[in-house]
Interface confidence: medium
């Protein structure tokens, strides 16, 4: 995933290296809120592979992806905003093994917000990059329903009311 | 239908993979399970692969096992197997709309270690 | 990850009784519970998922019931081609699963 002017591209498996594997996104978030379709090859075009991912001091790498985990406490929203501000996302959960790597970086046992929400427009859960959740993989444990936010707590996730204010992980 | 195949006895240590071949149904979009069931014992499921490609491992199987999948096929690879792993494997396919529920099995194909 | 217990491991039942087994989850699984049903040299087959919902082609006699920790199959008017072992599986997310199979229950027709 990449970040642009507070517009998130979705690459296909992390890696950009050549068009064919450019995945268009349509519904994507942008920084005022609205929602846009976009497709552009050439932000996709620079990304490549895990070895030349460079992370930003405070930052730590895993998988070719950089995550920041926060101290304070922000609701869903200013987190989401948050991110954006420093070229990144909320956090998405690709597999099992980044799912142990934040466990692993979480030290408290409380929830923490991650790039996901009940959009009304949908409902359905939508990961910030506009893909759906995997209901399969996923069971989010609480109502999904308008203002309904994601929180990762012990390697599970919770609906809770976007509202409440929670520490939140960045990802890029 | 499913078919696996693959197991035989083995020697403790010895990488073992089996093959679960799908017929009449696209591997790549479904949900594919193994589970494996020890002699005279429960059942105990292993791990899927989605249709994005994640892979998914119960907590006692990480680091035991790998699977991987082919447009027709799904296998499992028994990293170091040890006695405690003689059972035989099936292999399953989750056709629930939702929720995850087995739908369709393959015979199971048994190794011995 | 939630874990499964199944009561009673073996059960007897008369031709034409009534056999009930019990599927407690450690947590809250809501509706996500299946039960299979397996003969001797067989996969298993699925009876039941989302704790009520009959699969295609599986006789009325069987039903399930429950939500939330306690989930319960039933059959009703048994006959000898319900000897088999049983399980109940909850399916509420495969990322959070240690086992998702009971531990089986064996129905013995008499």
């Known amino acids: 995933l990449l970040v642009s002017q507070g517009v998130l591209l979705k690459c296909q498996k992390g890696s950009c290296s050549n068009a064919t594997q450019y995945e268009d996104t349509g519904d994507l978030k942008v920084n005022n809120g609205t929602r846009r379709n976009i497709s552009n090859k050439d932000l996709c075009a620079s990304r490549s592979a895990d070895q030349t991912v460079l992370c930003q001091s405070e930052w730590l790498k895993y998988q070719g992806k950089c995550y920041w985990f926060s101290n304070e406490m922000k609701s869903w929203s200013d987190s989401y905003v948050y991110c954006l501000e420093r070229k990144s996302h909320l956090l998405i959960i690709h597999d099992q093994l980044e799912m142990a790597f934040i466990q692993k970086n979480l030290r408290q046992l409380n929830y923490v917000w991650i790039g996901l929400n009940f959009t009304s427009l949908k409902m359905t859960w939508t990961w910030v990059d506009g893909s759906p959740i995997d209901s399969k993989i996923f069971f989010i444990k609480g109502p999904a329903k308008e203002n309904s936010c994601a929180a990762i707590k012990e390697s599970k996730i919770f609906s809770e009311t976007c509202s409440s204010v929670f520490k939140w992980i960045c990802q890029y | 239908s499913l078919e696996e195949s693959g197991g035989r006895l083995v020697t403790p240590g010895t990488p073992l993979t089996l093959t679960c071949t799908a017929s009449?149904?696209?591997?790549?979009?479904?949900?594919m399970s193994w589970v494996r069931q020890a002699p005279g014992k429960g059942l105990e499921w292993i791990g899927v692969?989605?249709?994005?490609?994640s892979i998914w491992y119960a907590n006692w199987a990480k680091g035991r096992f790998t699977i991987s999948k082919t447009s027709t096929t799904v296998d499992l690879k028994i990293t170091s197997p040890t006695t405690e792993d003689t059972a035989t494997y099936f292999c399953?396919?989750?056709?629930?709309?939702?929720?995850?529920?087995?739908?369709?099995w393959g015979q199971g194909t048994l190794v011995t270690v | 990850a939630s874990d499964m217990t199944q009561i009673p491991a073996s059960v007897s039942a008369v031709v034409g009784g009534t056999v009930t087994i019990d599927c407690q989850a450690s947590e809250d699984i809501e509706s996500y519970l299946a039960w299979y049903q397996q003969k001797p040299g067989q996969p298993p087959k699925l009876l039941i998922y989302d704790a009520s919902d009959l699969a295609s082609g599986v006789p009325s006699r069987f039903s399930g019931s429950g939500s939330g920790t306690q989930f319960t199959l039933t059959i009703t008017g048994v006959e000898c081609a319900d000897a088999a072992v049983y399980y109940c599986q909850q399916g509420h997310g495969y990322a959070h699963v240690d086992n998702a199979f009971g531990g089986g229950t064996k129905v013995v027709v008499k």
């Open positions: 009449g149904l696209t591997v790549g979009s479904s949900y």
């Open positions: 692969i989605v249709p994005s490609g």
């Open positions: 399953a396919r989750d056709g629930a709309s939702s929720g995850f529920y087995f739908d369709l």
